[in-house]
């Protein structure tokens, strides 16, 4: 079932500036008398099909109007979607016999944007390198996920990671910083060498990726970062 | 290896507060995010919210705002979880659970019995 | 929120049969952020299956997972009575992080 009762209501994920469609299956065989559309309780929309002439459509709520439409099945379509269309849509399709009810929770979602490390990292006399890292990205709120990763293994659970790099012990070592959320995710390399390398002391600066084409980007004269970005 | 070793049993009345205590050895602390997990008793796995070690941010489930909060002993590697006007409801098993990188619950401690009880 | 159903709530099963359980989700989740649990009476929960298929450290090959979108399960070969337990699924990629209600495998 597309649509849901009002028990359950049918997630929907928006991404934001793009459309979304709530879908509505009509109940088999029977005539419909009309259709309210309603949005955290209150109306948006209230339609009136016709066999032979196209439908009366009447839009209730002037906010989000001129980005409202409608498909042949009267399922609701949002275009150029905003944060605040989030929240609670409900369809009442009315027959001669009965009401049916379809409930839906609208959730907009940012795409993924121009992800960061900074970089804090000391060179000790010892020439073991204790890098501290932070990633972000544009906007995060708390549906994104961050995690870094080096050879596959998961090395932090946070926008941060702290690790000692020995160049002496380990060889050539990339941390890579992954941003993931419902709808997209970014990742972003650094290497530990050439954060390192050869400076008794490094206040790094911050390198940063967009969401270009290039699968690598050198990102600094040291192509010290190299950046990937999913849908 | 790692592990999470929780504080022991609690009995404590309506309205009074406990504080529940998670050490972590094993990782780097501050790399892993800290999730509490509510399981009352014959029932199932609630997340209560998750505290980021690095930052000190804490984010909870709608549920547990208000009367819970998490905080941190970053020194000593430790995770809290405070309960206060304790309810006869706050009566379960706490654990504290580390935040994998997918945000699986990876590692746990053994659990921190709470009852309240006039 | 979103939620996890899990069927069935009860099962049993003698030694050396093949068990599935299912999770079904509200709103379509990435594969990598759908989890599996087990915890036996008196126990922590233990994490056995992440990120949909791989498994947990020490988890022995008669557990697998699987699924994509709103679909998850999760399959013992063949069982065995140290398998009795609680198992819970678990979404990690929408706040609030949810869990499923539990299946209860019980021995035939």
């Known amino acids: 079932d597309a649509s849901q009762s009002s028990l359950t209501p049918l997630m929907v994920n928006g991404i934001l500036g793009e459309s979304v469609t709530l879908p509505l299956e009509f109940p088999a065989g029977e005539k419909v008398n009309f259709i309210t559309w309603l949005f955290n309780e209150t109306s948006l929309a209230f339609i009136v099909p016709h066999e032979t002439k196209s439908p009366e459509i009447h839009v209730t709520n002037p906010k989000q109007g001129k980005r409202l439409n409608f498909t042949q099945s009267y399922s609701l379509q949002l275009s150029n979607l905003k944060m605040e269309d989030t929240g609670s849509y409900r369809a009442q399709i009315s027959t001669k016999t009965s009401a049916k009810l379809s409930s839906y929770t609208l959730r907009i979602l940012r795409q993924l944007r121009n992800i960061q490390v900074t970089n804090h990292s000391q060179l000790f006399q010892n020439m073991t390198c204790e890098l501290h890292l932070t990633c972000s990205v544009e906007d995060a709120d708390d549906n994104v996920s961050f995690r870094w990763e080096a050879l596959g293994n998961t090395l932090s659970s946070q926008p941060n990671l702290t690790v000692s790099w020995d160049p002496r012990i380990s060889s050539e070592q990339d941390y890579t910083c992954i941003a993931e959320n419902a709808v997209s995710n970014l990742s972003f390399s650094v290497s530990a060498q050439k954060l390192c390398g050869g400076r008794s002391s490094l206040e790094g600066p911050r390198f940063e990726g967009k969401p270009i084409p290039n699968p690598l980007l050198g990102l600094d004269s040291t192509r010290t970062g190299h950046h990937h970005h999913h849908h | 290896q790692i592990q999470l070793v929780q504080s022991g049993p609690e009995l404590k009345k309506p309205g009074e507060t406990v504080k529940i205590s998670c050490k972590a050895s094993?990782?780097?602390?501050?790399?892993?995010?800290m999730n509490w997990v509510k399981q009352a008793p014959g029932k199932g796995l609630k997340w209560m919210g998750w505290?980021?070690?690095?930052?000190?941010?804490?984010t909870y489930a709608d549920d547990f705002k208000g009367r819970f909060a998490f905080s941190l002993e970053t020194s000593a590697s430790t995770a809290f979880l405070q309960i206060s006007n304790l309810k006869n409801e706050d009566t379960a098993t706490y654990f504290c659970a580390r935040r994998g990188g997918t945000a699986e619950f990876d590692y746990w401690g053994q659990g921190t019995p709470l009852t309240v009880s006039s | 929120e979103i939620v996890l159903t899990q069927s069935p709530t009860t099962v049993a099963a003698s030694p050396g049969e093949k068990i599935t359980i299912t999770c079904s989700a509200s709103?379509?989740?990435?594969?990598?952020?759908l989890h599996w649990y087990q915890q036996k009476p008196g126990f922590s929960p233990k994490l056995l299956i992440y990120?949909?298929?791989k498994l947990a450290s020490g988890v022995p090959g008669r557990f697998s997972g699987s699924g994509s979108g709103t679909s998850y399960s999760l399959t013992i070969g063949t069982m065995e009575a140290e398998d009795v337990a609680t198992y819970y699924c678990?979404?990690?990629?929408?706040?609030?992080?949810?869990v499923g209600a539990g299946t209860k495998l019980e021995l035939k």
């Open positions: 990120r949909t298929s």
């Open positions: 709103s379509s989740i990435s594969s990598n952020f």
């Open positions: 505290i980021n070690t690095y930052s000190g941010e804490a």
């Open positions: 094993g990782y780097t602390f501050t790399n892993f995010g």
């Open positions: 678990q979404q990690g990629i929408y706040m609030p992080l949810t």
